[in-house]
Amino acid sequence: CKAMHVAQPAVVLASSRGIASFVCEYASPGKATEVRVTVLRQADSQVTEVCAATYMMGNELTFLDDSICTGTSSGNQVNLTIQGLRAMDTGLYICKVELMYPPPYYLGIGNGTQIYVIDPEPCPDSDF
């Protein structure tokens, strides 16, 4: 049986502007031409979708216009960026990869990346 493996970093610290980036890499059992990548967040054992994009191999990754995610792809590697994060968004972010075409369909789940977000301290008032 051919298995699919998805790798992602264990921990990422978001920037002070609330931006977190990580790489989602997958070992493909087949030669997929259409791939769907989904970022999910796990909170209280519930997994919900954050954003998703389908791309053709060799083409750019395109998320919806109102998505908080952006990304680029290179072979079996996807560079994902999540924006607009706040401290309350700290949590486990899971990368899901689906090989949509050609058949057979494969689905792979990463172990999750724990993203830590620290809200910046407000600037102190200045008399100068």
Epitope: C1, K2, A3, M4, H5, V6, Q42, S45, Q46, V47, L92, I94, Y105, Y106, L107, G108, I109, G110, N111, G112
Partner: nanobody, 115 residues
Framework: EVQLVESGGGLVQPGGSLRLSCAAS????????MGWVRQAPGKGLEEVSS???????FYTDSVKGRFTISRDNSKNTLYLQMNSLRAEDTAVYYC?????????WGQGTLVTVSS
């Protein structure tokens, strides 16, 4: 070798309920993912609900609040309780399992929602 056998499909009226079962044999401790993937007529495969290696449970948006996934480890069986069924839930439902995804598949069970 892991084998998955689904049961519980059938014809049901809109608003009705069904409970799908997936009995697993030859199970290995390395199987961390178990889920349900469906294929509606003329459509591609779609992950419906799963229990992830991280311990979280996933539901696709269209079934949230209507479907419930559960797993009985003592019986090596995965269940999908489907309530308030709609015509758009008509599909072949496959049980899938693996270390981190769909390494093993069942033969599928057909669910038809029609009046």
């Amino acid at each position: 070798e892991v084998q998955l056998v689904e049961s519980g499909g059938g014809l049901v009226q809109p608003g009705g309920s069904l409970r799908l079962s997936c009995a697993a044999s030859g199970f290995s401790p390395s199987v961390n993912y178990m889920g349900w993937v469906r294929q509606a007529p003329g459509k591609g495969l779609e992950e419906v609900s799963s229990i992830y290696p991280t311990g979280g449970t996933f539901y696709t948006d269209s079934v949230k609040g209507r479907f419930t996934i559960s797993r009985d480890n003592s019986k090596n069986t995965l269940y999908l309780q489907m309530n308030s069924l709609r015509a758009e839930d008509t599909a072949v439902y496959y049980c899938a399992a693996g270390k981190y995804g769909t390494d093993y598949w069942g033969q599928g069970t057909l669910v038809t929602v029609s009046s």
